[in-house]
Interface confidence: low
């Protein structure tokens, strides 16, 4: 293609020289350069007469010679107006003008469809000087034309601030039909009508379309481009293409597969990503989508315990991202999990079931009957409690966490202690005197820390007081106990 101003330049080989005079392109006369003798060269095969009025721009020079003879108007000479040729052939055309010698530095530029053409290797300008005038012949050559070279070409010359423009030369590149719209692959519902479109252009026109289904022609008579094929419905996959014919020959479009939508295949590789006491994170690999996008998926969860009632929990989720966190499960329980996904046609079968387990839970009940004593003789606080009732799924009790907060005159200090699972008492050192100690206890399993007991407060006096009685968890409805010894 010719390189236009403001477009990316494409390199071309230098034109190999004048075409042989006998070469013709699709019966259109080929223009050749004139001989170098004479200042008014004649253009070979020129289809216009020298005396015909010129439609291009004319410049009337204001300058006169020494003898004061007025100079003739300047204009490009007429040349061939229309060239028709096949793709990939070479073409050369020119425009010529005679310019008085008083004008220096005249240049001719080539324009196509209103844009200046850059790339000097396409254009050659030759000068044939004489006593009074110089004949200038500008030749433009294209070694292998393409469809994009179609268009209207003109020469321009600037003299004395005037622009001289030649008549246009129309280049028409003909070739095999060129597809501007080809049929597209589609996924269709079984026995449902759909349309396919095919459009191709020349030149030369007209372009006729034949449709092909699975290697057999669908229409006996061609249709003028563009053509829309209405297929009443399919029961199985088919391949369609279209043939575009013009006087130059035949072009065949790409073959496109028309798939029949079906229910998806079941998901595969359901796997456990993470397990906690009350949730299981699963992922899966979706099966084949049945030529229709997945809409959503369903996670089915059954208790694997043989004594369970066999009920199934169903969790619906979006098809992406193939990941779901199943929540509200029991701790330390076994579950069977399957996944099914749907598209617009329907639901897939359920994936192979996998077995998953939740981990131990944290205790759900706080220790009971928390009692706090001040043992002043050893400067300790003794704590006693009762083991909370634990559910089997809460897991095995591994110990207790004791929080004791010491508050005195704007100071607040919280400490944590740990005791083994067999204990039901603990001893903590007095941290601050003349202060309130608030004690709370939580049971601990491998599943986590349970709720803390209600706070029990005891006042730790200054040194020298007597140990009277314990503080303990209040009975329901009682006020917050603070025992001041």
């Amino acid at each position: 293609a010719i390189t236009e101003a403001r477009e990316e330049a494409k390199p071309y080989p230098l034109f190999p020289g004048p075409f042989p005079g006998s070469l013709q392109t699709d019966h259109t006369p080929l223009l050749s350069l004139p001989h170098a003798s004479g200042y008014q060269p004649a253009l070979m095969f020129s289809p216009t007469q020298p005396g015909r009025p010129h439609t291009g721009n004319v410049a009337i020079p204001q300058v006169t010679s020494v003898e004061s003879k007025p100079l003739p108007p300047l204009a490009f000479k007429h040349t061939v107006g229309h060239i028709i040729l096949s793709e990939h052939k070479g073409v050369k055309f020119n425009c010529s003008i005679s310019v008085p010698n008083i004008y220096q530095d005249t240049t001719i530029s080539w324009w196509k469809d209103g844009k200046e053409l850059l790339g000097a290797h396409h254009a050659i300008t030759q000068f044939y000087p004489d006593d009074e005038v110089t004949a200038i012949i500008a030749s433009f050559s294209i070694t292998s034309v393409q469809r994009s070279d179609n268009g209207s070409y003109i020469c321009k010359m600037k003299i004395n601030n005037e622009e001289i423009v030649s008549d246009p030369i129309y280049i028409e590149v003909q070739g095999l039909p060129h597809f501007t719209k080809q049929p597209e692959s589609m996924n269709v519902t079984r026995n449902t009508a759909f349309n396919l479109t095919c459009q191709a252009v020349g030149p030369p026109e007209p372009v006729n379309i034949f449709w092909v289904q699975n290697s057999s022609r669908v229409n006996e008579q061609p249709e003028k481009s563009p053509s829309v094929l209405t297929v009443p419905g399919l029961t199985e996959m088919a391949v369609f293409s279209c043939e575009a014919h013009n006087d130059k020959g035949l072009t065949v479009s790409k073959g496109v597969q028309i798939n029949i939508k079906a229910i998806p295949s079941p998901p595969t590789e359901v796997s456990i990503r993470n397990s906690t006491a009350h949730s299981i994170l699963i992922s899966w690999v979706p099966g084949f989508d049945g030529y229709s996008p997945f809409r959503n998926c369903s996670i089915q969860v059954k208790e694997a315990d043989p004594l369970s009632n066999g009920s199934v929990m169903i969790f619906n989720t979006s098809a992406l991202p193939h990941l779901y966190q199943i929540k509200q499960l029991q701790a330390l329980a076994n579950y069977s999990i399957g996944v099914s996904c749907m598209n617009e046609i329907g639901w897939s079968a359920v994936s192979p079931w996998i077995l998953a387990s939740t981990t131990e839970g944290a205790p759900s009940v706080a220790p009971l009957n928390v009692t706090v004593f001040l043992n002043e003789s050893s400067d300790n606080v003794d704590i006693r409690w009762m083991k909370p009732p634990t559910k089997q799924q809460d897991g095995e009790l591994v110990g207790y966490r004791i929080s004791h907060v010491w508050q005195s005159a704007g100071i607040s200090k919280e400490l944590l202690e740990e005791v083994g699972q067999n204990g039901s008492r603990a001893r903590i050192s007095v941290q601050v005197h003349n202060a309130t100690c608030t004690v709370r206890i939580a049971a601990v399993t491998r599943g986590g820390v349970g709720p803390f007991s209600d706070p029990v407060k005891i006042f730790i006096p200054a040194h020298g007081w007597v140990d009277y009685a314990p503080s303990s968890t209040p009975a329901p409805g009682n006020a917050d106990p603070v025992l001041i010894i």
């Epitope: 993470n274 981990t359 095995e396 591994v398 110990g399 207790y400 966490r401 944590l416 202690e417 740990e418 005791v419 083994g420 699972q421 067999n422 601990v444 491998r446 986590g448 820390v449």
Partner: antibody
């Protein structure tokens, strides 16, 4: 005072087994869990497993399951860690560490036992 | 497994500098994070437990904070004897994983 004393360094061939001991003193042996941690040369710390001496509760890191065995002898206040099918990447210093309370931090550590696996 | 991502992996600081190390858990570990100090050829030593509690005898320049997934260990004023490798560790779920360690060097 609390002390955890481990057995001496060992050199083993690939495929062999090694048994490292950790003798506890200065506290009530059955009241504290004992963990095992290893450290390959120039690398970080890696948890192997835990044993509760009071009831022989054991929890192993899945990575070592099938190759590691933890036992305890309450009469000598000693815990043992045996690792079988040794490979060169098992070359490391193996530590026992006492867990304070029943959850969380390791307050006392053994001095470490270097196990070298080399053909 | 719960991953404990510790950063930076190494850092240089001067005596008296404030040094901060972070540890990010791949899922919530509540406050069950401990920080340990290890010097070459020695067993690790406990510094901080339950994310923010200083262990007995540990100098007050060492502190910890955070809960859930993000934890921070700070030395408020670096001393020469603090040059060591520091590790975080979670105890929420077995296997009880450590961070990859932060090697602290003197500038």
């Amino acid at each position: 005072q609390v002390q955890l004393v481990q057995s001496g360094a060992e050199v083993k061939k690939p495929g062999a087994s090694v048994k490292v001991s950790c003798k506890a003193s200065g506290y009530t042996f059955v009241s504290y869990w004992m963990h095992w941690v290893r450290q390959a040369p120039g690398q970080g710390l890696e948890w192997i497993g835990v044993i509760d001496p009071s009831d022989n509760y054991i929890n192993y890191n899945q990575k070592f399951r099938g190759r590691v065995t933890m036992t305890r002898d309450t009469s000598t206040s000693t815990v043992y860690m045996e690792l079988s099918s040794l490979r060169s990447e098992d070359t490391a210093v193996y530590y026992c560490a006492r867990e304070a309370g029943t959850r969380g931090y390791f307050d006392y550590w053994g001095q470490g036992t270097l196990v070298t696996v080399s053909s | 497994d719960i991953q404990m991502t510790q950063s930076p992996s190494s850092l240089s600081a001067s005596v008296g500098d404030r040094v901060t190390i972070t540890c990010q858990a791949s899922q919530s570990v509540s406050n069950t994070v401990a920080w340990y100090q290890q010097k070459p050829g020695k067993a690790p030593k406990l510094l901080i437990y339950y994310a923010s509690n200083r262990y007995t005898g540990v100098p007050s320049r060492f502190s910890g904070s955070g809960s859930g997934t993000d934890f921070t260990f700070t030395i408020s004023s670096l001393q020469p004897e603090d040059i060591a490798t520091y590790y975080c560790r979670q105890d929420t779920r077995s296997p009880f994983t450590f961070g990859q360690g932060t090697k602290l060097e003197l500038k």
